[in-house]
Interface confidence: low
Amino acid sequence: IPVIEPSVPELVVKPGATVTLRCVGNGSVEWDGPPSPHWTLYSDGSSSILSTNNATFQNTGTYRCTEPGDPLGGSAAIHLYVKDPARPWNVLAQEVVVFEDQDALLPCLLTDPVLEAGVSLVRVRGRPLMRHTNYSFSPWHGFTIHRAKFIQSQDYQCSALMGGRKVMSISIRLKVQKVIPGPPALTLVPAELVRIRGEAAQIVCSASSVDVNFDVFLQHNNTKLAIPQQSDFHNNRYQKVLTLNLDQVDFQHAGNYSCVASNVQGKHSTSMFFRVVESAYLNLSSEQNLIQEVTVGEGLNLKVMVEAYPGLQGFNWTYLGPFSDHQPEPKLANATTKDTYRHTFTLSLPRLKPSEAGRYSFLARNPGGWRALTFELTLRYPPEVSVIWTFINGSGTLLCAASGYPQPNVTWLQCSGHTDRCDEAQVLQVWDDPYPEVLSQEPFHKVTVQSLLTVETLEHNQTYECRAHNSVGSGSWAFIPISAGAHTHPPDE
């Protein structure tokens, strides 16, 4: 580490005095200090002498000696005060520029350490500092305003009490710059626009930034529009607004509009599309199949997408039958707006009952007219089965009726013993009826089929079972000849 002579941290001299500062190191050494007049520099190998024979208040400052070849970068310093009764301050810079929230050092150096007790910082013309200005003082360096704010961009003076009066430094201008995080923030409203030819329209392009230096423009397709700009300062941000007013739109006004803003950090742009149409429109669609099948007891949401301009004047869900004359409860209908011209309407049908199968229609109206979209809802049911013994054309016949949706398949089983349900070990014979007779098949109703099993003689220690199944479940009926009746099972889901 270099060594300075005289070996004191501070040196106090009077104006006109001779000052010699000598620095010695292992290798070559260099001096660094405030820019001031009358210094003479003499270097000789590993030593360097800084001297003046006419010190002035401007020589006040910290002088540092470094050894450039030292890998540890060691240095030594001495602070020189040249105490001039007429000049308590040596101002090293008259303009200081920092970013917001940085510490701002105002470099007014005290020329006499004795004056430290009576120093203060003021704004020019003796005005007090702004409230909440947090600052500290060092006689070697000056005043530091901590975490400077944009609003603290002012002209300051350092004040010292000398013999009961305040002596001011020359002024120091502090410029606190906003930290510009990036290009200006943008809004372009509306995000989408539709108008009928001849209607009025308004598009507003707006940009804001913490710094006033930015540009904003609105362009249609690739043409920059000449629009007067409104400026404002609000919430500590500068705002520039371009408003395009079109009294009577025509097809040439349609297309892509881009709002573009730029500053030193870069450019931002956002776009919207303006559609001009000949007349009002209203389009209904659904991502769902319009023919729906749901198991009874389950729920279903019917969704309709609406694209419309102008806005809807009315809409509702209607049940068109064929069962009850009930109408969907309004609380089960829900509307959400995805954007200005697109809406989704949902009808929630929880725990569907048999009487709720049928056609549901969504109707909407705007100045373009009425439109409707109709869903057909069929309920699925597990099969219900019954078996009777009868004679057909003189032959004993077991007649099985199965009702459900989708159309049930029928299988006959003959098994040994009396049982409510044939299991594999008991089965003697199995007959599949691939084409049972369809007794009824109306839209939105269950399908009823009938299957006949001709039995010449009923074996009394056996069971005849009719089983029906579809995609929802299965049902069966066991017929036991010896008994007065037969055993049935409810449908298995």
């Epitope: 809004t187 308004q202 507003v204 707006s206 705002q239």
Partner: antibody, heavy 126, light 107 residues
Framework: EVTLKESGPALVKPTQTLTLTCTFS??????????VGWIRQPPGKALEWLAN???????YYNPSLKNRLTISKDTSKNQVVLTMTNMDPVDTATYYC??????????????????WGQGTMVTVSS | DIQMTQSPSSLSASVGDRVTITCLAS??????LAWYQQKPGKAPKLLIY???SLQDGVPSRFSGSGSGTDFTLTISSLQPEDFATYYC?????????FGGGTKVEIK
């Protein structure tokens, strides 16, 4: 300075039509995003929103009163007028008009009542 | 219509107390909520907009929070001039609806 003032009859008879005028200054109802609304408050009760009119002549009404209310504006006179038909004693209230602050960029629209009139008390009685 | 349920309907508090008023929306209103203060015989005054933004000139002891369906107005240290009735207002959907009000009285 933004100011609004309501004027109209202090007493109306049942079944009559009430006409209230809101005269304002310090802003223009032609400014993009600007609106004026009406709110009422029966004695000792909560506030109830009645209607809004916007710079582009868009109008919105409280559905519970919609077939009785009409809102209109005269931008040249800086006035908004509310008419309410078929008045009933339950309509006795203080009626306020209020400005709906304009759109401030780049923030979203200020859709709230930021300046209010002093209110006018309307009594419905035969 | 969206119902705004304010609670409590009234409360007694002392100067310096921390006071919390809640407003519950019957469905999601995002942050489209304002708080107003009304003194007897006076028009309401806007305190908070967009659920948490403080209106210019309103003391910082007032703050708002919440989004969706649950909202809170907090007065961090009640002052004598804060004794009044407070209302919430939703403007997410028409019709705009106010809460029933909360009367803050001196204990």
């Amino acid at each position: 300075e933004v100011t609004l003032k309501e004027s109209g009859p202090a007493l109306v008879k049942p079944t009559q039509t009430l006409t209230l005028t809101c005269t304002f200054s310090g802003f223009s109802l032609t400014t993009y995003g600007m609106g004026v609304g009406w709110i009422r408050q029966p004695p000792g009760k909560a506030l109830e929103w009645l209607a809004n009119i916007w710079w582009d002549d868009d109008k919105y009404y409280n559905p519970s009163l919609k077939n009785r209310l009409t809102i209109s504006k005269d931008t040249s006179k800086n006035q908004v007028v509310l008419t309410m038909t078929n008045m009933d004693p339950v309509d006795t209230a203080t009626y306020y008009c209020a400005r709906i602050g304009p759109i401030k960029y780049p923030t979203a629209p200020y859709r709230y009542f930021d300046f209010w009139g002093q209110g006018t008390m309307v009594t419905v009685s035969s | 219509d969206i119902q705004m349920t304010q609670s409590p309907s009234s409360l007694s508090a002392s100067v310096g107390d921390r006071v919390t008023i809640t407003c519950l929306a019957s469905e999601d209103i995002y942050d489209n909520l304002a708080w107003y203060q009304q003194k007897p015989g006076k028009a309401p005054k806007l305190l908070i907009y967009y659920a948490s933004s403080l209106q210019d000139g309103v003391p910082s002891r007032f703050s708002g929070s919440g989004s969706g369906t649950d909202f809170t107005l907090t007065i961090s240290s009640l002052q004598p001039e804060d004794f009044a009735t407070y209302y919430c207002l939703q403007d997410s959907e028409y019709p705009w609806t106010f809460g029933g009000g909360t009367k803050v009285e001196i204990k």
